[in-house]
Interface confidence: medium
């Protein structure tokens, strides 16, 4: 039968006071010689020679410092031999546990921990979780880590609060603004013996970055701008709207998107945005007409690429800005409306006898011109002749068979109209068709002046073809958009100007 | 299980320092032992050269210690050792080994043995 | 030269015993334990013996060793091919650090 004992032994101290630290003895040496053997960790294993036994009387001493962290207890294998060398008892596993001293400080996982959180998070919102360890034993005041924020900069007001047992750091409110404060840095401190004076300590960084939200609404740097626009003219750059908006730069949160409340339904203007600047540029892409509006009021208002936060949802006020926008007239002088007509000429029509009427449109009153003379330009086979006061179109001669085989049956010429004030020139397509010569030639007796586009059909109000292209570069507040200073004259293309 | 490894540039020219680090796997190098260096020239005898316990703490060969610097990389769960103005008499197969170090109580002597040796690598110093 | 002094090499055939001698001084030997190390050719150095006579778990009982005063010896008995190899005893010295002998080259006959 084994008789035994083990006291517990203290890492990093001298504990050879407390020898014998152990002792075993078999009760089998009332009668016989026995030798005691251990083995085990800390004696024939690593760490070696830390326990020796005394083979006659089973005392067992300790020779040197443990560590509880390498070895939280020994286990001694102890053995009773006779002198044959054979086991007098069964073997016995004897425990010496060691108890722990606080000789190591807790320890971050990380030297700088990194996180990240919405401006405007509500109080008590979760940042981030820092995660330190303490080697010394487990549910015990030497390991029990109390956190502690220690330091925060910018140091204006604390923003944050870290639970001391779990090391959890949350909003302490809901005032972060990354408008005032981009970014945070925390020192925190982690205390062993749960944060008691005696404990030891690590400190940590902690750097938060404060996310943007759309807390900012946008606004544009004037309420009101006047521009002067010519009539019938593009322009690409007739101003420049720059907003203001507080939120992070380039992002969806700052990029505005200008849009028009009021006064573009006949689709004459778009603002495209510089996402680079937060400038809008305010085109001109459908030229307007003096003569139809000579002043228009635009309203616009702004928004941001990116929905707006809740937190200001209810303060978002829809606020315009208004453009006052003059149209300024342009002496457009007379243009042929439409450019080309059609007209018919019989077998039966003879010399002097009337085809046509084809009249300039003065623009700027709508009516016919009264300061045009008009010439004939192209007239293949000197058919026509033109009255230079009203533009009545008459045949020269009847037309003969030469003729008309000659023309194919088509005439194609031009009449100019000559503005001799404004030295300008416009130039109309004359369209013919030559009836063929049969034997019925003669029955359509009346002149036949029926006026019809190059289509066929019934006279049109088919629009002159409109010059697009248009640059500028006038930038001043008072915009202009004269011929030259980067707006395109769009006056139709049968409209020459010189003498 | 802990294993060590030794990893260095390799040949170094006399007058120029030698440096090596000592990789520690499978455990941490915080633990309680001292990390020690050690070196044999070829056909010769065992020489410490110096150890460094995790929180800097060194014993260092006094014959060696104006020209040895031994330092530890919790980080990276390393230790390094660096030796300068080296000549040929420096050229050996350097160990690594894992030492455990004792003051021995009042009557009990010290222990200082190692239980854990890396494969050793062999530095020449030559021009 | 080595602080701990050792024979450079000792023989034997198979199955006799050898004795590997270390002597020292009042410093190391005389005051510290004594640890014996084995080196296989080509590998690195295995502890053989600790805390001066006794033997690491898994270390055969035909190795043993023993201390008195400045001096210690290892003895090998019932020699095999396998125990071919050098032998290194060390210390610590309270004033110099480690010191190993010289070591020991052991041939098996």
């Known amino acids: 039968e084994w008789i035994k004992f083990a006291a517990a032994c203290r890492e990093g101290e001298d504990n050879s006071k407390r020898n014998p630290i152990a002792k075993i003895h078999s009760d089998c040496a009332a009668n016989q010689q026995v030798t005691y053997r251990i083995s085990g960790v800390g004696i024939d294993q690593p760490p070696y020679g830390i326990f020796v036994i005394n083979q006659k009387t089973g005392e067992i001493n300790i020779t040197s410092i443990v560590d509880r962290e390498v070895t939280p207890f020994f286990i001694i294998y102890c053995r009773a031999l006779n002198s044959m060398g054979q086991d007098l008892e069964r073997p016995l596993e004897l425990r010496v546990r060691v108890l722990d001293i606080n000789d190591n400080p807790p320890v971050f996982s990380m030297a700088t921990f990194a996180g990240q959180i919405e401006e405007n998070s509500n109080a008590n919102t979760l940042v981030m979780i820092l995660n330190a360890t303490d080697a010394d034993e487990p549910n015990n005041l030497n390991s029990k880590i109390a956190f502690k924020i220690i330091r925060q900069e910018p140091s204006d007001s604390p923003m944050f609060i870290i639970n001391r047992n779990t090391g959890e750091i949350r909003t302490m409110n809901n005032f972060l603004d990354r408008e005032q404060y981009g970014q945070y840095a925390l020192a925190v401190r982690g205390s062993d013996r749960d944060g008691g004076a005696d404990g030891m300590s690590a400190e940590c960084e902690c750097n938060i970055k404060i996310l943007d939200v759309n807390d900012n609404i946008p606004y544009m740097e004037q309420s009101s701008y006047t521009i002067e626009i010519q009539e019938n003219t593009l322009n690409s750059n007739l101003l420049e709207i720059r907003v203001i908006d507080l939120d992070e730069e380039f992002s969806a949160n700052w990029m505005a998107v200008i849009f028009f409340i009021s006064g573009n339904e006949g689709n004459w203007f778009e603002i495209e945005m510089n996402e680079r600047t937060n400038v809008g540029i305010l085109k001109v892409v459908k030229p307007l007409d003096y003569e139809a509006m000579q002043s228009l009021q635009l309203s616009i208002g702004v928004r941001n690429k990116a929905e707006f936060h809740h937190s200001i949802m209810s303060q978002y006020k829809l606020k315009a800005s208004a453009i006052s926008v003059t149209v300024l007239n342009v002496i457009e002088g007379p243009v042929f409306r439409p450019g080309s007509k059609t007209y018919v000429v019989t077998g039966n029509m003879g010399s002097n006898d009337k085809v046509g009427d084809f009249v300039a449109t003065d623009l700027d009153t709508g009516r016919p011109s009264t300061t045009v003379r008009y010439v004939m330009g192209n007239n293949p086979a000197d058919l026509l002749a033109v009255d230079s006061r009203t533009g009545k179109l008459t045949l020269k001669n009847k037309v003969t068979k030469e003729q008309y085989n000659m023309l194919g049956g088509k005439y194609q010429g031009t009449i100019l109209s000559i503005d001799d004030n404004l030295q300008r020139t416009c130039t109309g397509t004359i369209n013919i068709n030559i009836q063929s010569f049969g034997n019925d030639d003669r029955t359509n007796t009346e002149p036949n002046t029926k006026i019809t586009t190059n289509t066929g059909r019934q006279e049109s109000t088919s629009s002159t073809n409109y010059d697009t292209s248009t640059t500028s570069t006038d930038s001043s507040q008072v915009y202009s958009s004269e011929p030259g200073n980067g707006a395109k004259d769009l006056l139709s293309d049968n409209v020459h100007f010189g003498p | 299980q802990v294993q060590l490894q030794e990893s260095g540039p390799g040949p170094v020219k006399p007058s120029g320092t030698l440096s090596l680090t000592c990789g520690v796997s499978?455990?941490?190098?915080?633990?309680?032992?001292?990390w020690t260096w050690v070196r044999q020239p070829p056909g010769k005898g065992l020489e410490w050269i110096g150890e460094?316990?995790?929180?800097?703490?060194?014993f260092l060969n006094p014959s060696l210690k104006s020209r040895v610097t031994i330092s530890v990389d919790k980080s990276n769960n390393q230790f390094s050792l660096k030796l300068t103005s080296v000549t040929a008499a420096d050229t050996a197969v350097y160990y690594c080994a894992r030492g455990w170090h004792r003051t021995g109580f009042r009557g009990y002597p010290s222990h200082w043995y190692f239980d854990l040796w890396g494969r050793g690598t062999l530095v020449s110093v030559s021009s | 030269q080595s602080v701990l002094t050792q024979p450079p090499s000792v023989s034997g055939t198979p199955g006799q015993r050898v004795t590997i001698s270390c002597s020292g001084s009042?410093?190391?030997?005389?005051?510290?334990?004594v640890y014996w190390y084995q080196q296989l050719p080509g590998t690195a150095p295995k502890i053989l013996i600790y805390s001066n006579d006794q033997r690491p778990a898994g270390v055969p009982d035909r190795f043993s060793a023993s201390k008195s005063g400045t001096s210690a010896s290892l003895a090998i008995s019932g020699l095999r091919s396998e125990d071919e190899a050098d032998y290194y005893c060390?210390?610590?010295?309270?004033?110099?650090?480690?010191?190993f002998g010289g070591g020991t080259k052991l041939t098996v006959l």
């Open positions: 499978g455990g941490s190098i915080s633990s309680n032992h001292w």
């Open positions: 460094i316990y995790h929180n800097g703490s060194t």
């Open positions: 009042s410093s190391h030997i005389g005051s510290n334990y």
């Open positions: 060390a210390a610590w010295d309270d004033g110099q650090g480690g010191v």
